[in-house]
């Protein structure tokens, strides 16, 4: 039922994810489900705008960190990624695109320069950065 | 008139508690995060926490056992409250409020401090 | 923590001269560097946001520059009225520090 697969463009080891929808899903097709989270890497870089609406437009949002227990595979996530965290000027938050606001303590925030989008990295870490450049992202899909 | 203002006791015996009030005026405390500064005589100074927009807070791992940070955003109002003083503690307090830009960013308006001497 | 290194500790100088004022991340931090300016018995006033960004009412003759572990503050034409010390602070990471400052006096 568990198979290692290995993912090589997203990951910096071997993770075990479960394969079967049974135990996990629906997910999208070639997405990876773990956890009741549908997760998808897309390697080609756009800006965090353009990730959103590329997310959107498969029924899914830019990835949201809610729980290192239940996303402990983002601990082996390599490079950086566009997440859905973003600066709300107008409340001086820093929200998820669902409005919720980042926990504190739930990701190391690092400020390499201004900016009002952040990319994810691994280990529960967050770069500040500027919304225009080109990242790659991740997309994210709740099952339940 | 973007305005910050401390209040505190100005004396506190060693190993009692401190309680400062910071109240801004100007702008609202749903739309600015406030952090907490001291300079001890003479020397630099230290970031002891932020309160954020949403209520949440970030302490300095050097103070967080006996630091709380709390806020009133109908009165304006920015609570601190530290713990166990000793001698070293005595410091001028600020608050500042964090400029609208970046995430951990920097601190564009300042209040005047105010002083706390811990003795006995 | 990022430790950031101010120096020289003090600076000499005499009105109308440019000063540099050197501050020094013990690792990279890129822009995210922050000066301020505080005159004896008054709070500190932010000068210079993110390196090299300017703030509204703080005169021209102040300048920023640098990016990574090494940033600094100058000021053109020196005058009276700018004897004060002079922070950095990083907004890297949590903590946030500040160097140990840099006084400038007259000589």
């Known amino acids: 039922i568990w198979s290692a697969v290995f993912l090589n463009s997203l990951f910096n080891q071997e993770v075990q994810i479960p394969l079967t929808e049974s135990y996990c899903g629906p997910c999208p097709k070639n997405w990876i489900c773990y956890k009741n989270n549908c997760y998808q890497f897309f390697d080609e870089s756009k800006n965090w705008y353009e990730s959103q609406a590329s997310c959107m437009s498969q029924n899914a949002s830019l990835l949201k960190v809610y729980s290192k227990e239940d996303q402990d595979l983002l601990k082996l996530v390599k490079s950086y990624h566009w997440m859905g965290l973003v600066h709300i000027p107008t409340n001086g938050s820093w929200q998820w695109e669902d409005g919720s606001i980042l926990s504190p303590n739930l990701l190391t925030i690092i400020e390499m320069q201004k900016g009002d989008c952040a990319l994810y990295a691994s280990s529960f870490k967050g770069y500040i950065e500027n919304c225009s450049t080109p990242n790659t992202y991740i997309c994210m899909q709740r099952t339940v | 008139q973007v305005q910050l203002k401390e209040s505190g006791p100005g004396l506190v015996a060693p190993s009692q508690s401190l309680s400062i009030t910071c109240t801004v005026s100007?702008?609202?405390?749903?739309?600015?995060?406030i952090s907490w500064f001291r300079q001890p005589p003479g020397k630099g100074l230290e970031c002891l926490g932020v309160?954020?927009?949403?209520?949440?807070?970030n302490y300095n791992s050097v103070f967080k056992s006996r630091l709380s940070i709390i806020k009133d955003n109908s009165k304006s109002q920015v609570f601190l409250k530290m713990n166990s003083l000793q001698t070293d503690d005595t410091a001028r307090y600020y608050c500042?409020?964090?400029?609208?830009?970046?995430?951990?960013?920097?601190?564009?308006?300042w209040g005047t401090g105010t002083t706390v001497t811990v003795s006995s | 923590d990022i430790l950031l290194t101010q120096s020289p500790a003090i600076l000499s100088v005499s009105p109308g001269e440019r000063v540099s004022f050197s501050c020094r991340a013990s690792?990279?931090?890129?822009?995210?560097i922050h000066w301020y300016q505080q005159r004896t018995n008054v709070s500190p006033r932010l000068l210079i946001k993110?390196?090299?960004e300017s703030i509204s009412g703080i005169p021209s003759r102040f300048s920023g520059s640098g990016s990574g572990t090494d940033f600094t503050l100058s000021i053109n034409n020196v005058e009276s009225e700018d004897i004060a010390d002079y922070y950095c602070?990083?907004?890297?990471?949590?903590?946030?520090?500040f160097g140990a400052g840099t006084k400038l006096e007259l000589k």
């Open positions: 500042a409020r964090k400029g609208d830009e970046g995430y951990w960013g920097y601190f564009d308006v």
């Open positions: 100007g702008f609202s405390l749903t739309s600015y995060a």
């Open positions: 309160i954020w927009t949403g209520g949440g807070t």
């Open positions: 690792q990279s931090i890129g822009t995210s």
């Open positions: 993110y390196a090299s």
């Open positions: 602070q990083h907004s890297n990471r949590w903590p946030l520090t």
